[in-house]
């Protein structure tokens, strides 16, 4: 029959070439004399001459060895004609298939491979995965198929089997529990890659494994003891710089302390912050000490990290001994502002009231005293007992100096310590009000006609507070009366000036006494132009001129 | 010479919980991973649980996950398992065991934990 | 259902050889070298006498060996003698967090 079965030729044949693979035969030849040829990629197309055919005989012939991983299969046509060139068979199809050979070794993708893995995990932990080719076979024989090894793992600590690597996959996983960064913090490792599944030709590649940082060691304190000294009543005065040490990566937040005052400071005294570059616990006062109340504070304080510990680690503690240094402290007027109520008026000499400082130091210092601003000379202070008394006369109604009936009064206190401090109070006069003012009216200038004259309404103010005020009493002196007549309206705040009997155009002094309630009598004189005119009128009319 | 000691086993009812400790000496036991292996009566051996070195790793295997927890104190060389919510399926004898990379040595005498009503 | 198959039991007489299988897959038996071998007598607790396919720890007799073939391990122990009448289980290594498989255990007895 005008067939063949697929031919198997192996890879990298060394010959001799031509090499007969195969003879086709047509049952024809026995009619007519035949002649073979064949066709296709191999023989008359790309790449050429590698298969011919005896035309004659039939016989297949190989010209040159295969290469299997350039081309696996060859399929081409063979074809049988008579002498005259007619086609005697239809075309047959021939396939050679190309048998692999071992002839290539298995290639890692990379020369180097890098992974990853936490310190402290368990077996079974995947690493990373690494990969090698091979161009041969793996399909109908083991040539291509690579089985992965670990060679070597340098360093061996804490021994040479950290790792293991899936023989198919070449997948790397961790079995043994002992990795320790703070001991080795990477492993290199000869990986192989061998073909014929693990009984052929070998590959080199290596896998660096680094080894990642768990936070599993407790940062401690290095020295733990510490002595500091403070100057008392200073804020954010730096106390004392900790030191500690954590083997873990440094700056990470399993490196980063964090800083805690478990004990000692009863009195929220203190705070402590980390240093951002050295990791140092800095220590300062958030309050002012105070040496005369405690001159010592021993404080406790716990370092742990910004990580939390992935295990149970024992937290280091530090102490600290502060000793408080004594300062002069200024004297401290008590109470810092003092209010005190005094009669306006009072005699030259009178005493106001003793105001005196206490000074924070335990020493028995000397306080003197002395008055810092004092705007309108009124007082003067002893300077040994604090006695505050009137050289002036004190005026409540003395706009210049005196508001809402408050004298200010600022006054010092200095002790003799070395160098000496000072501490100042604010002394508050609360001026009692004494009725040393009569009432005035307002305006004391008025202008009224003659004819039909409009009644004055005059104002009446009283610098006193009640009940030195209104009700007002009006009377007219000095005979004012025989033109005028003055009265107090209801409210008792008004008085009301008319004008009663004819008087010429000519400016005239009515006048005006006024007292109030508690009898303060005020004479005032009321300048009163009177004009030729009817009613109302704001200023005299000039002279009538005809026309 | 190297010694594990368990103890804490007992009986206990379902939903019931128990502590197991696993005293070791003779060894650094700091260095060395822990698990918990258990044997049910007449059955095979059943990995129940592992703990790393440092203590900062830990597994379970499925049928006591959320159940139990097992921890380590390396001051005092001694592994835990804190077992909650027992089941009558938990009865067994509990071994704590060393873990040599994948392989277990040395092992306790164990001790037992049985859950009944 | 154990992870890995043994045979429930094989037996021998004094002096013979016998051999106890452990199949597992190529995950697990297949791709490591880390099958373990343990013996447990009545009452006692388990011993390891075989580590990494075929090392024996120290004290261990040399009647005990071990091998490896595709998914399946293999423990033989050569010259029975009455005192290796005891149940044996396998253990591989798996890449995952059950990382240790149980096999289901073989009763070896001694004729």
């Known amino acids: 029959d005008w067939v063949v079965a697929p031919i198997s030729v192996p890879e990298n044949g060394k010959g001799p070439f031509p090499q007969r693979l195969n003879q086709l035969k047509s049952n024809k030849d026995r009619d007519t004399k035949i002649f073979y040829s064949i066709t296709g990629p191999g023989a008359d197309s790309p790449p050429e001459g590698v298969f011919a055919v005896e035309k004659e005989t039939g016989w297949l012939l190989l010209n040159k060895p295969l290469d299997r991983e350039e081309i696996a299969k060859y399929e081409l046509f063979g074809h049988a004609v008579s002498e005259n060139g007619a086609s005697v068979e239809d075309p047959m199809n021939i396939s050679i298939i190309v048998t692999d050979q071992n002839d290539h070794k298995p290639k890692f993708t990379q020369d180097t491979f890098r992974g990853s893995v936490l310190e402290g995990v368990l077996p079974g932990t995947s690493v990373m995965q690494v990969t090698a080719t091979d161009e041969d076979d793996a399909i109908y024989t083991y040539n291509g198929v690579v089985a992965y090894s670990i060679h070597s793992q340098e360093p061996k600590d804490p021994h040479d089997l950290m790792f293991t690597i899936h023989r198919s996959t070449g997948t790397i996983s961790v079995i043994s529990s002992g990795l320790d960064r703070e001991k080795v913090p990477e492993y290199t490792l000869t990986i192989q890659a061998t073909d014929m599944d693990g009984d052929g030709s070998t590959t080199t590649a290596v896998a660096v494994v680094e080894i990642l940082d768990a936070n599993d060691n407790a940062p401690m304190f290095d020295p733990q003891k510490y002595e500091a000294h403070v100057p008392e009543n200073a804020v954010g005065h730096e106390v004392q710089r900790l030191t500690v040490t954590d083997l873990d990566a440094p700056n990470s937040p399993a490196w980063r302390a964090t800083y805690l005052i478990m004990g000692g400071d009863d009195g929220d005294h203190f705070t402590i912050t980390t240093h951002p570059e050295s990791n140092q616990g800095i220590l300062t006062t958030r309050k002012g000490l105070d040496f005369e109340a405690k001159n010592q504070h021993t404080l406790y304080v716990e370092v742990t990290n910004e990580a939390p510990f992935v295990l149970k680690l024992p937290t280091s503690t530090a102490t600290i001994v502060v000793h408080v240094e004594d300062v002069n402290e200024a004297p401290v007027f008590v109470p810092p502002s003092k209010v005190v109520e005094v009669q306006e008026g009072i005699p030259t000499g009178e005493p106001v009231c003793v105001y005196t400082a206490e000074d924070p130091d335990k020493e028995n210092q000397k306080i003197s005293y002395r008055i810092l601003r004092d705007p309108a000379g009124w007082l003067a202070m002893d300077p040994d007992s604090g006695q505050v008394t009137a050289v002036g006369t004190l005026d409540r109604e003395d706009e210049q100096f005196v508001r809402n009936n408050i004298y200010e009064v600022m006054v010092l206190a200095m002790d003799n310590g070395s160098p000496p401090t000072t501490g100042t109070g604010t002394l508050l006069l609360t001026l009692i009000d004494v009725n040393d003012h009569g009432p005035v009216p307002e305006p004391r200038q008025i202008t009224i006609c003659n004819q039909s004259p409009v009644r004055q309404v005059l104002n009446i103010t009283d610098k006193d507070l009640s009940p030195h005020t209104s009700p007002f009493q009006a009377q007219l002196t000095d005979d004012s009366d025989i033109y005028w007549t003055a009265e107090v309206n209801e409210e008792g705040d008004t008085v009301v000036l008319s004008l009663k009997k004819f008087l010429k155009q000519d400016t005239y002094d009515v006048h005006l006494s006024l007292s109030d309630h508690g009898n303060k009598e005020q004479l005032t004189v009321i300048r009163a132009t009177v004009c030729d005119c009817h009613g109302h009128v704001e200023t005299c009319p000039g002279p009538w001129k005809g026309g | 010479e190297v010694q594990l000691l368990e103890s804490g086993g007992g009986l206990v009812q379902p939903g019931g919980s128990l502590r197991l400790s696993c005293a070791a000496s003779?060894?650094?036991?700091?260095?060395?991973?822990m698990s918990w292996v258990r044997q049910a009566p007449g059955k095979g051996l059943e990995w129940v649980s592992a703990i790393s070195g440092s203590g900062g790793s830990t597994y379970y295997a499925d049928s006591v996950k959320g159940r139990f927890t097992i921890s380590r104190d390396n001051s005092k060389n001694t592994l835990y398992l804190q077992m909650n919510s027992l089941r009558a399926e938990d009865t067994a004898v509990y071994y704590c065991a060393g873990l040599d990379r994948v392989w277990f040595d040395p092992w306790g005498q164990g001790t037992m934990v049985t859950v009944s009503s | 259902q154990s992870a890995l198959t043994q045979p429930a039991s094989v037996s021998g007489s004094p002096g013979q050889s016998i051999t106890i299988s452990c199949t597992g897959t190529s995950n697990d038996v297949g791709a490591y070298n880390y099958v373990s071998w343990y013996q447990q007598h009545p009452g006692k607790a388990p011993k390891l006498i075989l580590s990494e396919v075929n090392k024996r720890p120290s004290g261990v007799s040399n009647r005990f060996s071990g091998s490896k073939s595709g998914n399946t391990a293999s423990l033989s122990i050569s010259g029975l003698q009455a005192e290796d009448e005891a149940d044996y289980y396998c253990t591989s290594y798996r890449m995952d967090s059950t990382f240790m498989l149980f096999g289901g255990g073989t009763k070896l007895t001694v004729l």
């Open positions: 003779g060894f650094t036991f700091s260095s060395y991973a």
